[in-house]
């Protein structure tokens, strides 16, 4: 029962998660002009990754978008790139971990398939997580140093046009969104993570029986849950005390999350 | 037809007060930022105060704490309330709508305010 | 705040001909981020409230004959009347609509030569 909270909680922290990233990326407000310490001025101005916006004291709003690919920094060009990568990852961990949870049944799929695509998933929420952690976080130190370094006619915008009045520009909204939904999604990613620990059908639990293989020269398969980590291979033929009561055959017959890997 | 009438202007004692309105037909006031502007007999356009979305209203410099801005969205009105009137607020009080690029496009008739002892 | 001053503070120009009038802000209008100029510019009849002509610097209200034209950047703009027309006769002004207060020029009075 606590396997299958586990994991439906990790999809659903997930789902947020990716939704966040989704909203952060299409968001405008990724840098907004700085207020503090400018002329009180009658136009806002701020920026997204994909195009640039200017809302009006009249409540009119125009925005611009980025047509070229060559034009811009680097920089934003690789935040783009993260963002999408962590998206990507973020919808085929959903897939994924939609066929894995616990609470689904499809067909005959085997409990060792589910803990292998909970792990599947898990670890791809874990990398979106951090690739919108990242494109957030070089975003912001993008504005950190632009903000530092703007004078009058210094080129800061994304648009690669020149400053005749100092405009500089901090933390959006979408930042701090970026960063919240990158970390929900990574917490997401480790609970699916722990829930697969639990999925494996070797969890079964005979708590009144403890067997114990005589001698040392049983090799075992990898991977019992409670000996080793669950994401390297225990290679060493050594007993594995997890309370479980099974013959060497049951072991043997069931395979393993590190089969699929 | 959009049409913006000012009324609430006549002739007050310096210190004294006064409630300019500006009623709107044609247009819904609420939805756009407006401004109060005067122009003192003779004299060129002197803009006196602004209200946008979420009620953020911004003053001339010698208006300031002594003047405000609001309005009714109910009555479709715009409002200044003049406090401590002095002569050199003597003038003709015109509201006007800002649009594109913050320009005032539609603007009323305009009302006269005379401070006099 | 931002000064606007306009030039000449008189202009007589015979009908059909070309009228001039030119505004200088104190700081740049121009907006970074959209790459427009925050200036307009009015014209006022006697007995009448202003009306809009150009904003953003260089685009005509609708409505406006076109031979209303604006231009300039930064700092320096002109109003263009490319042939003078007797209904044009009046006071006109500009606005800076960038910086708080939106400041106005102290107005150029248009007369017929």
């Known amino acids: 029962m606590a396997v299958t909270a586990c994991q439906g909680l990790g999809f659903v922290v997930s789902l947020i998660g990716i939704a966040g990233i989704i909203a952060a990326t299409c968001m405008d407000q990724w840098s907004t002009q700085d207020l503090y310490n400018n002329p009180v001025t009658a136009v806002f101005n701020y920026q997204g990754l994909w195009r640039s916006c200017v809302r009006e004291s009249s409540g009119f709003t125009e925005c611009r978008g980025y047509f070229t690919l060559l034009g811009l920094p680097a920089m934003l060009q690789a935040v783009r790139a993260l963002m999408i990568v962590g998206i990507v990852l973020g919808a085929i961990g959903l897939l994924v971990s939609i066929f894995a949870l616990k609470c689904i049944r499809i067909g005959s799929m085997e409990d060792s398939a589910k803990a292998n695509m909970t792990l599947t998933s898990g670890i791809m929420f874990i990398v979106s997580g951090l690739c919108a952690i990242a494109g957030v976080s070089v975003f912001a130190n993008m504005l950190v140093t632009n903000f530092w370094m703007s004078t009058a006619n210094m080129y800061t915008g994304m648009g690669g046009m020149v400053q005749t009045v100092q405009t500089r520009y901090t933390f959006g909204a979408a930042l701090f969104v970026g960063w919240v939904a990158g970390g929900l999604t990574l917490i997401g990613g480790v609970m699916m993570c722990i829930a697969c620990r639990g999925l494996a059908p070797e969890e079964t639990n005979y708590k009144a029986v403890s067997y114990h293989a005589s001698g040392h020269s049983v090799a075992y398969k990898p991977g019992g849950f409670k000996a080793s980590t669950g994401f390297g291979s225990n290679t060493k033929n050594k007993k594995i005390y997890d309370g479980g009561a099974r013959t060497e055959d049951e072991v043997q017959s069931y395979p393993s999350k590190h089969d699929y890997v | 037809e959009v049409q913006l009438v000012e009324s609430g202007g006549g002739l007050v004692q310096p210190g004294g007060s006064l409630r300019l309105s500006c009623a709107g037909s044609?247009?819904?006031?609420?939805?756009?930022?407006m401004s109060w502007v005067r122009q003192a007999p003779g004299k060129g356009l002197e803009w006196v105060s602004s209200?946008?979305?979420?009620?953020?209203?911004y003053y001339l410099d010698s208006v300031k704490g002594r003047f405000t801005i609001s309005r009714d969205n109910a009555k479709n009105s715009l409002y200044l309330q003049m406090n401590s009137l002095r002569a050199e607020d003597t003038a003709v009080y015109y509201c006007?709508?800002?649009?594109?690029?913050?320009?005032?496009?539609?603007w009323g008739q305009g009302t006269l305010v005379t401070v006099s002892s | 705040d931002i000064v606007m001053t306009q030039s000449p503070d008189s202009l007589a120009v015979s009908l059909g001909e070309r009228a001039t009038i030119n505004c200088k802000s104190s700081?740049?209008?121009?907006?970074?981020?959209?790459?427009?100029?925050?200036l307009t510019w009015y014209q006022q009849k006697p007995g009448q409230p202003p009306k809009k002509l150009i904003y953003?610097?260089?685009t005509r209200e609708s409505g406006v004959p076109d031979r209303f034209s604006g231009s300039g950047s930064g700092t320096d703009f002109t109003l263009t009347i490319s042939s003078l027309q007797a209904e044009d006769l009046a006071v006109y002004y500009c606005?800076?609509?960038?910086?708080?207060?939106?400041?106005f020029g102290q107005g150029t009075k248009l007369e017929i030569k």
């Open positions: 606005q800076n609509n960038y910086f708080y207060p939106l400041t």
């Open positions: 006007a709508r800002k649009y594109h690029g913050n320009a005032l496009d539609y």
């Open positions: 044609g247009i819904t006031l609420s939805t756009y930022a």
């Open positions: 209200i946008i979305s979420g009620g953020i209203t």
């Open positions: 953003w610097a260089s």
């Open positions: 700081q740049s209008l121009l907006n970074s981020g959209n790459q427009r100029n925050y």
